[in-house]
């Protein structure tokens, strides 16, 4: 989606992204020749971010605000190439990606946050839910993890059956070009999944089937 357009404004960066970028630059200065273990580096950054005070985070939040303003300004004048606005074909009958344990937890506690802080932005609600999840003991996370695992299992069966049948409309519409490599296909599916989860965030939680799990 517009990945190839060099004129497209660079996406806006979050305060955490700016922080990570700064960490990376610091690391490069200190160890110019060292190769970075990405997962270890990410973990260290995340730990540092968690312990930082609001004051310390402030400068990164200011950078993010400025970048958001830049992005919005540039997007106003940006004209996408023809056909670019069209979303990738998504079969409405395809099984929906299962929610994560954290997502299930959010569905449960979002009313609490919204009820106590009615004016909170979506981002701040998410932040508070993240804090709550971090404060939830492993024992209390278990029911959500169990349910998420159950839903994941079901999804894997459903997606296997769905793929076995073949994406129905896709072939008819001539969307399927040459056979893509498995890796490329998986990457695209992951992207779709991420989109699905973002869309699901906004959906009401009412249709969530409940397990009467004994803890």
């Amino acid at each position: 989606m517009g990945k190839g357009d060099p004129k497209k404004p660079r996406g806006k960066m979050s305060s955490y992204a700016f922080f990570v970028q700064t960490c990376r630059e610091e690391h490069k200065k200190k160890h110019p020749d060292a190769s970075v273990n990405f997962s270890e580096f990410s973990k260290k950054c995340s730990e540092r971010w968690k312990t930082m005070s609001a004051k310390e985070k402030g400068k990164f939040e200011d950078m993010a605000k400025a970048d958001k303003a830049r992005y919005e300004r540039e997007m106003k004048t940006y004209i996408p190439p023809k056909g670019e606005t069209k979303k990738k074909f998504k079969d409405p009958n395809a099984p929906k990606r299962p929610p994560s344990a954290f997502f299930l937890f959010c569905s449960e506690y979002r009313p609490k946050i919204k009820g106590e802080h009615p004016g909170l932005s979506i981002g701040d609600v998410a932040k508070k839910l993240g804090e709550m999840w971090n404060n939830t003991a492993a024992d209390d996370k278990q029911p959500y993890e169990k349910k998420a695992a159950k839903l994941k299992e079901k999804y894997e069966k459903d997606i296997a059956a769905y793929r076995a049948k073949g994406k129905p409309d896709a072939a008819k519409k001539g969307v399927v070009k040459a056979e893509k490599s498995k890796k490329k296909k998986e990457e695209e599916e992951d992207e779709e999944d991420e989109e699905d989860e973002e869309e699901e965030e906004d959906e009401e939680d009412e249709d969530e089937e409940e397990d009467d799990d004994d803890e």
């Epitope: 009313p111 609490k112 106590e116 999840w133 404060n135 939830t136 029911p143 409940e210």
Partner: antibody, heavy 120, light 113 residues
Framework: EVQLLESGGGLVQPGGSLRLSCAAS????????MVWVRQAPGKGLEWVSR????????GYADSVKGRFTISRDNSKNTLYLQMNSLRAEDTAVYYC?????????????WGQGTMVTVSS | DIQMTQSPDSLAVSLGERATINCKSS????????????LAWYQQKPGQPPKLLIY???TRESGVPDRFSGSGSGTDFTLTISSLQAEDVAVYYC?????????FGQGTKVEIK
Amino acid sequence: EVQLLESGGGLVQPGGSLRLSCAASGFTFSGYMMVWVRQAPGKGLEWVSRISPSGGQTGYADSVKGRFTISRDNSKNTLYLQMNSLRAEDTAVYYCAREEGGSYGAFDIWGQGTMVTVSS
Amino acid sequence: DIQMTQSPDSLAVSLGERATINCKSSQSVLYSSNNKNYLAWYQQKPGQPPKLLIYWASTRESGVPDRFSGSGSGTDFTLTISSLQAEDVAVYYCQQYYSTPRTFGQGTKVEIK
């Protein structure tokens, strides 16, 4: 004002049933874990049961498992405890409490309690 | 289940003196992921429901006088009343919320000497 008010206690014979209610007000009931805690006369506190905000997850003390059922009606801001096959050792003051789930898990708001006496 | 044991069972302290209550859990209630102790302290006065005093082992609930303080980590915890007042006469309970079932200590009765 944040408040919890229990009702439904009373005298019941061994083997009998009772349904306790707890009416919540002053907070977003549907966003909180709720619990029942009991206290036998002259004794300490005993956790009985808990229920998740949506009602999908429940937990019970071994002493009441299979006999007691916790439930909630978020549209009525009410918590329930259905007590069946009651025994003399179930005699206690039953408190409903709000569990500050996710924020700190402790029981921060308590009702005044309702007395349940199981005796023939 | 995590067992909670309080000591002493009862305590008589002069007004203005320090009162110390201990609580021991049968296993650690410290969650390594966030370095928090899942332990609370409650005060119960005769004929009243319990009242939350301390959570996270050492964080005072809002409105609780600062003469009440909590300390400890892992399995050993302490509630201290720095200068006992007449209105502090009550039974004090520790409680773990690290795992289900939630469990309470047997209680410590604080009286005035």
